[in-house]
């Protein structure tokens, strides 16, 4: 199934998307939808670029903050609510036959967690978990197959982003 | 709400070019979604043939490619299907049909080629 | 092409019955996978999406299922306006391939 990224409401949500431009600047129309992506196109767009910039946005909580221009497309969800919670498309509109690349991303929204962490379990969940976690200031994610990710359960995640919050994180599971 | 209607000539005969028009009402078609035909064959197969995008951009079924070509009038909110030196193998019902998953279909066009 | 094998060509059934049509692609689609009915001398329609994701409007009496390679449409309760023809579509790679249909009558 999709890969899952988990983010707090109230804070960033980061989803990772990237092509690589061939050649170097030859950037391609790409489009973020709501919703597992359909046949064509994007479902209830929430942001499209065409080959030079952004230029469709439905709300100013949709970002793309990463270097756009070499390809990292990776949307960034201002300020989540619980009704930001679902499957997200973000489709790489390559010309040719057909060649668009598609890839749906989860994310689930999660209220704030009310345990207080111990003050050393961020340093030794990141240290055991070390992909999980993307923020809005990364590039994309190193590309994974969704059963490459460390088992982690969901007390583990809900007192993970308790530790987060202020940093705007987003975690990523299978 | 999105609507489209097919028209055709209903018969053709062998080798000459078949022109399909689609008709699209309560949506521009440079606004959005892949403007689309289909076929569906007698024995009810259906076939996608081709589609052109609301920027213009087409792209063709392979096993059609040297055959077909899909065009639109934007200023009478029209798309066109061209199949050059038919066979009595297209004979078939044509659909024109939009939408992300194509949610919207016109009521199809049945086409025979007969000499 | 990505070959849809969809079974059975037909099948009949009853009124209340649960029935069960499948879609096997020559290889993996990833789930891009959607179910479309069609009644007599009516273009398709759009059922579902994404294996699961039911097109609006549709009763929850349809369900999708699977992955990998194969799929299936369940239909529980059978009503009489459910007799018609089904199609499954991949929209893994182009160009689209149809399954060769699956029509349901009434037994």
């Known amino acids: 199934s999709e890969v899952e990224y988990i983010a707090e409401v109230g804070q960033n949500a980061y989803l990772p998307c990237s092509y690589t431009p061939a050649p170097p600047g030859n950037l391609v129309p790409v489009c973020w939808g709501k919703g597992a992506c359909p046949v064509f196109d994007c479902s209830n767009v929430v942001l499209r670029t065409d080959n030079r910039d952004v230029n469709d946005r439905t709300s100013g909580r949709y970002w793309l903050k990463g270097d756009f221009h070499k390809g990292d497309v990776s949307l960034t969800i201002e300020n989540v609510t619980l009704a930001d919670s679902g499957v997200y498309c973000c489709r790489i509109q390559i010309p040719g036959i057909m060649n668009d690349e598609k890839h749906n991303v989860k994310l689930v929204v999660i209220k704030p967690a009310k345990v207080t962490p111990a003050p050393t379990l961020q340093r030794d969940l990141t240290s055991a978990f070390p992909r999980m976690l993307t923020t809005g200031e990364h590039g994309p994610a190193e590309t994974q197959t969704p059963g490459s990710l460390p088992d982690v359960n969901l007390t583990q995640i809900f007192t993970l982003t308790n530790e987060l919050r202020d940093s705007g994180a987003t975690i990523r599971t299978a | 709400d999105v609507q489209l209607q097919e028209s055709g000539p209903g018969l053709v005969k062998p080798s000459q070019s078949l022109s399909l028009t689609c008709t699209v009402t309560?949506?521009?078609?440079?606004?959005?979604?892949?403007w689309n035909w289909i076929r569906q064959f007698p024995g009810n197969k259906l076939e996608w043939m081709g589609y052109?995008?609301?920027?213009?951009?087409?792209s063709y079924n392979p096993s059609l490619k040297s055959r077909i070509s899909i065009t639109r009038d934007t200023s009478k909110n029209q798309f066109f299907l061209q199949l050059n030196s038919v066979t009595t193998e297209d004979t078939a019902t044509y659909y024109c049909?939009?939408?992300?998953?194509?949610?919207?279909w016109g009521q199809g066009t049945t086409l025979t080629v007969s000499s | 092409d990505i070959v849809m094998t969809q079974s059975p060509s037909s099948m009949s059934a009853s009124l209340g019955d649960r029935i069960t049509i499948t879609c096997q692609a020559t290889?993996?689609?990833?789930?891009?996978l959607n179910w479309y009915q069609q009644k007599p001398g009516k273009p398709p329609s759009f059922l579902i999406h994404?294996?699961?994701e039911l097109a609006e409007g549709v009763p929850s009496r349809f369900s999708g299922s699977g992955s990998g390679s194969d799929y299936s449409l369940t239909i529980s309760n059978l009503e009489s306006e459910d007799f018609a023809d089904y199609y499954c579509?991949?929209?893994?790679?182009?160009?689209?391939?149809f399954g060769a249909g699956t029509k349901l009558e009434l037994k």
């Open positions: 049909t939009s939408g992300g998953n194509f949610d919207y």
């Open positions: 309560g949506y521009s078609i440079t606004s959005d979604y892949a």
């Open positions: 052109i995008n609301y920027s213009g951009r087409t």
């Open positions: 290889q993996d689609i990833v789930k891009n």
């Open positions: 994404y294996v699961t």
């Open positions: 579509l991949q929209f893994y790679e182009f160009p689209l391939t």
